[in-house]
């Protein structure tokens, strides 16, 4: 069965300087491959977070993603700025075989509105 990626919130509002959580769950970890968060779509989309061990300032995972059966890939963005506004997508990839990973499923997106403090 095809993996499903769920982002339950269509939008969230956060005051500048505060933190916000963007929720994402998947129905399966198979086929093996990373899960990444992006802001925007198409060629100009920006990688926001990858669950592959790298460090991303101001962003961290919410659940313990080292659990081998973890299906929760929500993230917390700290010290939000107006530049963080936009639509965020949680994307499941299938690992590539000596080529780039292949995107197989994306969540519906969560729009982040940043309110002036």
């Amino acid at each position: 069965t095809e993996v499903k990626v769920t982002q339950p919130e269509k939008s969230v509002s956060v005051a500048a300087g505060d933190s916000t959580i963007l929720n994402c769950t998947v129905t399966s970890l198979l086929p093996v491959g990373p899960i990444r968060w992006y802001r925007g779509v198409g060629q100009s989309r920006l990688l926001i977070y990858s669950f592959t061990g790298e460090h991303f300032p101001r962003i961290r995972n919410v659940s313990d993603t080292t659990k081998r059966n973890n299906m929760d890939f929500s993230i917390r963005i700290s010290n939000v700025t107006p530049e963080d506004a936009g639509t965020y997508y949680c994307v499941k990839f299938q690992r590539g075989s000596s080529e780039p990973d292949t995107e197989i499923q994306s969540g519906g997106g969560t729009e982040v509105y940043v309110l002036a403090k």
Epitope: V32, T52, D64, T66, K67
Partner: antibody
Framework: DVQLVESGGGVVRPGESLRLSCAAS????????MSWVRQAPGKGLEWLAG????????YYPASVKGRFTISRDNSKNTLYLQMNTLTAEDTAVYYC???????????WGLGTLVTVSS | SYELTQPPSVSVSPGQTARITCSGG??????YAWYQQKPGQAPVTVIH???KRPSDIPERFSGSSSGTTVTLTISGVQAEDEADYYC???????????FGGGTKLTVL
């Protein structure tokens, strides 16, 4: 630099128990899953147990499940392996290893030798 | 569970290319790594996540995959590369780690 130092090995008699320790430094221990791997003399590598970063989830192959227990104390940056009802077949060098994001291993300790002999 | 199969031995002359294969995993659910072990020493990870090389590992080590077979390639083999090489796998379906039986690389 990442450093993993095992201790607690030694000579024990069949049927006895032993607890191994692995002291970790040079990285954020509480953020990484960990595993134990052993190698019998002249043999290959055998995975024994894995544990999530928070310590709530543990994983074992059928060969040692119920007899070996992995645990960790994140406040002490230490990983443990409790081994019960040891037999001669458990004689091996025991390594602790740090897991990558996808549960392979990137850093290994130097190992501690366990000898089970009457 | 699954078994990973490696050739027991591979021989190569210095400066040549050595290829060590590992088969038996399910590409849909398995990640692979390669571990080098010299006599009396602990294993060292030379490749993880199929083809990722740790920063302190020479560029002559590379990993690739094709179907259910993964390959460790050592280009321009040096005498210091003589060691046992273990293929390792993590199966996301069963949550189990497995090792191949190991391949002894001899540099002639």
């Amino acid at each position: 630099d990442v450093q993993l130092v095992e201790s607690g090995g030694g000579v024990v008699r069949p049927g006895e128990s032993l607890r191994l320790s692995c002291a970790a430094s040079g990285f954020t221990f509480s953020s990484n899953a960990m595993s134990w791997v052993r190698q019998a003399p002249g043999k290959g590598l055998e995975w024994l147990a894995g544990i999530s970063a928070g310590g709530s989830d543990t994983y074992y192959p059928a060969s040692v499940k119920g007899r070996f227990t992995i645990s960790r104390d994140n406040s002490k940056n230490t990983l443990y392996l409790q081994m019960n009802t040891l037999t001669a077949e458990d004689t091996a060098v025991y390594y602790c290893a740090r897991e990558t994001w996808n549960h392979l291993f990137d850093y290994w300790g130097l190992g501690t030798l366990v000898t089970v002999s009457s | 569970s699954y078994e990973l199969t490696q050739p027991p031995s591979v021989s190569v002359s210095p400066g040549q290319t050595a290829r060590i294969t590992c088969s038996g995993g399910d590409y849909y659910s398995t990640y692979y790594a390669w571990y080098q072990q010299k006599p009396g020493q602990a294993p060292v990870t030379v490749i993880h996540s199929d083809d990722k090389r740790p920063s302190d590992i020479p560029e002559r080590f590379s990993g690739s995959s094709s179907g259910t077979t993964v390959t460790l390639t050592i280009s321009g083999v040096q005498a210091e590369d003589e060691a046992d090489y273990y293929c390792g796998g993590y199966d996301g379906r069963t949550y189990i780690n497995t090792f191949g039986g190991g391949t002894k690389l001899t540099v002639l």
